[in-house]
């Protein structure tokens, strides 16, 4: 997790001076509880957005925003913390908005956005807005909180960020499997413009079944370049076990841009279909 | 323009099965995660389930999981909710929400974000 470029962060606005500031998740509150708090939040939205850095490549951001609620409690708000926790590594960022003017009712509400935390490809996130200083221990909570899952690689609006592009996500391979006499299989991929090696995992399973019964890998060779964005051809030989006959293809790159973290392509060859066994044709009819 | 059309809401028996359908058109479909809401007879709105744009991630509020199953056709521009096992307590006008964004809002407090709602689609549950 981390924010988008380290340019001025802003959040003033016409009425309010507002500064943006790293913070350790734990406000200051937490620990001197303060006798009068704000209300939490309203309608907090978590969008996700694009920004470019300042050296032009593209990341998807959270896009934070929020509204204050119109009740007296805004004469007390001094700021705001926004966390935004990875849930599958408990990775957490915050930062806080700290207002250096006191907030007054105005003919509109007050809103707030914040579009600067970088988000991964396929990640999920919880996004916590809390109003400072915090409540109480015993306190009604002052804070929103909201789920977030970004979509991944093969989401076509996210294939063109930089952090998708880095592991591979504009190579197609186009992978066609073709089922041949003798227990073989041909496959068949295009190849991207880089040489660099690519590595086919052949996983075998039965019918409706969801162990391996078979396992093969095997090694291509980097391509020269008047080999770029060829078809490459590979024929492989299967073990003669009756019944391990569905085949999951898989294609690993190693670009040098995600070495041996690139996207994976797959294909998969179902069994073949089992003919219905026909109904016997009587002899005779029966009259009755 | 920009639309969501439910159908396949009627009156059914306790125990029986029905499947809702939601036409998309007007936007780039598979780009974005969709999501059921009900309302019930003098009740406030109440999200049931949600999937993301490629179905990698399905969610369901608790009343519902195990037998209601959402889905979705992205080569149809079609959003499907099947319930199976109804109760009377599932009587409710049923409603298809597109999310604004292109990320997936999980659970219950995502309905204040969806910019996009069908008309609804009425299942009553009665014997």
């Known amino acids: 997790l981390r924010l988008l470029d380290h340019r001025a962060l802003v959040c003033s606005q016409p009425g309010l001076n507002c500064t943006v500031k790293n913070s350790t998740c734990l406000d200051d509150s937490w620990i001197h509880p303060r006798n009068l708090t704000p209300s939490s939040p309203k309608d907090l939205q978590i969008q996700l957005h694009f920004a470019h850095t300042q050296q032009g490549d593209l990341f998807p951001v959270a896009h934070i925003e929020w509204t204050l609620q119109t009740d007296a409690s805004i004469l007390y708000l001094e700021g705001a913390e926004l966390s935004v926790l990875q849930l599958n590594t408990n990775e957490r960022l915050c930062v806080r908005f700290e207002f250096l003017s006191k907030l007054r009712h105005h003919h509109r509400r007050w809103r707030f956005t914040f579009s600067h935390f970088v988000v991964d490809p396929d990640q999920e996130y919880e996004v916590t807005v809390h109003h400072l200083p915090k409540p109480i221990p015993d306190g009604d909570p002052n804070h929103q909180s909201k789920n977030f899952l970004v979509p991944d690689c093969e989401h076509a609006r996210m294939k063109v960020t930089t952090p998708c592009m880095s592991s591979g996500s504009l190579w197609d391979p186009n992978i066609t499997v073709e089922t041949l006499e003798a227990h073989q299989l041909r496959v068949s991929f295009t190849l991207w413009n880089e040489s660099t090696h690519y590595q086919i995992l052949l996983t075998s399973f039965p019918h409706m079944e969801n162990h391996s019964c078979f396992e093969h890998m095997h090694h291509i060779p980097a391509p020269r370049p008047e080999e770029f964005h060829q078809r490459s051809n590979v024929t492989l030989t299967l073990r003669n076990l009756k019944g391990c006959c569905r085949h999951q293809v898989q294609i690993q790159p190693f670009f040098s841009s995600c070495l041996n973290d690139c996207l994976r392509h797959s294909a998969t060859v179902s069994c073949p279909e089992m003919p219905d066994t026909p109904e016997p044709i009587p002899d005779y009819m029966p009259l009755w | 323009q920009v639309q969501l059309v439910e159908s396949g809401g009627g009156l059914v028996q306790p125990g029986r099965s029905l499947r809702l359908s939601c036409a998309a058109s007007g936007f780039s479909f598979d780009d974005y995660a969709m999501h059921w809401v009900r309302q019930a007879p003098g009740k406030g709105l109440e999200w049931v389930s949600g999937?993301?744009?490629?179905?990698?991630?399905?969610d369901y509020v608790d009343t519902v999981k195990g037998r209601f199953t959402i889905s979705r056709d992205n080569a149809k521009n079609s959003l499907y909710l099947q319930m199976n096992s109804l109760r009377a307590e599932d009587t409710a006008l049923y409603y298809c929400?597109?999310?604004?964004?292109?990320?997936?809002?999980?659970?219950?407090?995502?309905?204040?974000?969806?910019?996009?709602w069908g008309q609804g689609t009425m299942v009553t549950v009665s014997s």
């Open positions: 929400a597109k999310e604004r964004s292109l990320g997936y809002c999980r659970g219950g407090s995502c309905s204040d974000g969806f910019d996009i």
């Open positions: 999937i993301s744009w490629n179905s990698g991630r399905v």
